[in-house]
């Protein structure tokens, strides 16, 4: 499984420190955890927290690790062969074919739909027409009403066709 | 009888709001929800979201999340939907619509004369 | 999200022609579908919901049918005055949905 990779996600260059572990590649590629020296001869850690490589590659750096966002919260940090996992707060969810940034979740549903599904971190809530025949909020008015000017007032009806 | 009485023409320049108003009579406002639905010239129909002017709850198509803010005015029975950071793509027709949800399926059976608001710099 | 697909996109008929006007939905919307006529320049019109219910004041010569997923609109004799284009819109779940519109004109 290859990832797509672009120049951005490329962790700047380091000379190998001390700290940063060496080893040969095999067969031209480094394992996770690890990007390829220049030379092709080496195989140099990925620091923990700043960089990662998920598979075996020939990658000359490790990608940079992803950083969440406000609005996101931290499920796991980034170690040298896994990238941050970031999820929605509560109450928000990322779309599909949005998901640079987590939306808000519905708090409700249109009378005459009911609600079907919770808020989650990857989903909003969906609203569902009622099936025929139940009571909308035991107001079905058998003619049309008048506009009052408070809710509170009885509205007094008056025989309209739409 | 039912009517939706919009406000009038509005010009924006990119990045601004507008606020359309709809004004209800003939009918208990708080019964019915109110739903904007736009139309850009030679366009089909995009519903926006709507609000239950009794709870003043609301729902909004993704499409405009964060960019519009449905509420309302009980007392003088009208509803207002503001959309900001407009940009050219807004230019449309805005239509208010009252969701009638008795009976055996929901429908907007009164839509509003409609609001043009022009995006332009 | 629930796509309406109108067919077709635009039609000609004559005076006193039997026109159909066909609406698919992406998934099952059971009856929850409703037809508008918009003329130009002007605010939607309901014609039918619940996709068969003929909306009071509506004429006669419009009716729908269908369920789930397929839905028709049909004008038993077309009149000058119905020069107009028709919407879909499923009203099962939300976002509400319409579909593209269908232009009728007379021939």
């Known amino acids: 499984e290859s990832a797509l990779i672009t120049q951005q996600d490329l962790a700047p260059q380091q000379r190998a420190a001390p700290q940063q572990k060496r080893s040969s590649p095999s067969e031209g590629l480094c394992p996770p955890g690890h990007h390829i020296s220049e030379d092709g001869r080496d195989c140099i850690s990925c620091k923990y927290g700043q960089d990662y490589s998920t598979h075996w590659n020939d990658l000359l750096f490790c990608l940079r690790c992803t950083r969440c966002d406000s609005g996101e919260v931290e499920l796991s940090p980034c170690t040298t062969t896994r990238n941050t996992v970031c999820q929605c707060e509560e109450g928000t969810f990322r779309e599909e074919d949005s998901p640079e940034m987590c939306r808000k979740c519905r708090t409700g549903c249109p009378r005459g739909m009911v609600k079907v599904g919770d808020c989650t971190p990857w989903s909003d809530i969906e609203c569902v027409h009622k099936e025929s025949g139940t009571k909308h909020s035991g107001e079905v008015p058998a003619v049309e009403e008048t506009v009052t000017s408070s809710p509170g007032t009885p509205a007094s009806p008056c025989s309209l066709s739409g | 009888q039912v009517q939706l009485v919009q406000s009038g023409a509005e010009v924006k320049k990119p990045g601004a709001s507008v606020k359309v108003s709809c004004k209800a009579s003939g009918y208990t406002f708080t019964s019915y929800d109110i739903n904007w639905v736009r139309q850009a010239t030679g366009q089909g129909l995009e519903w926006m979201g709507w609000?239950?002017?009794?709870?003043?709850?609301?729902g909004y198509a993704q499409k405009f999340q964060g960019r519009v803010t449905m509420t309302r005015n009980t007392s003088i029975s009208t509803a207002y939907m503001e959309l900001s950071s407009l940009r050219s793509e807004d230019t449309a027709v805005y239509y208010c619509a009252r969701w009638n949800h008795y009976g055996s399926g929901s429908h907007f059976d009164y839509w509003g004369q409609g609001t043009l608001v022009t995006v332009s710099s | 999200d629930i796509q309406m697909t109108q067919s077709p996109s635009s039609l000609s008929a004559s005076v006193g022609d039997r026109v159909t006007i066909t609406c698919r939905a992406s998934?099952?919307?059971?009856?929850?579908l409703n037809w508008y006529q918009q003329k130009p320049g002007k605010a939607p019109k309901l014609l039918i919901y619940a996709a068969s219910s003929l909306q009071s004041g509506v004429p006669l010569r419009f009716s729908g049918s269908g369920s789930g997923t397929d839905f028709t609109l049909t004008i038993s004799s077309l009149q000058p005055e119905d020069i107009a284009t028709y919407y879909c819109?499923?009203?099962?779940?939300?976002?509400?949905?319409f579909g593209g519109g269908t232009k009728v004109e007379i021939k």
């Open positions: 609000m239950n002017p009794n709870s003043d709850n609301t």
């Open positions: 998934q099952s919307i059971s009856i929850y």
């Open positions: 819109q499923q009203s099962y779940k939300t976002p509400l949905t």
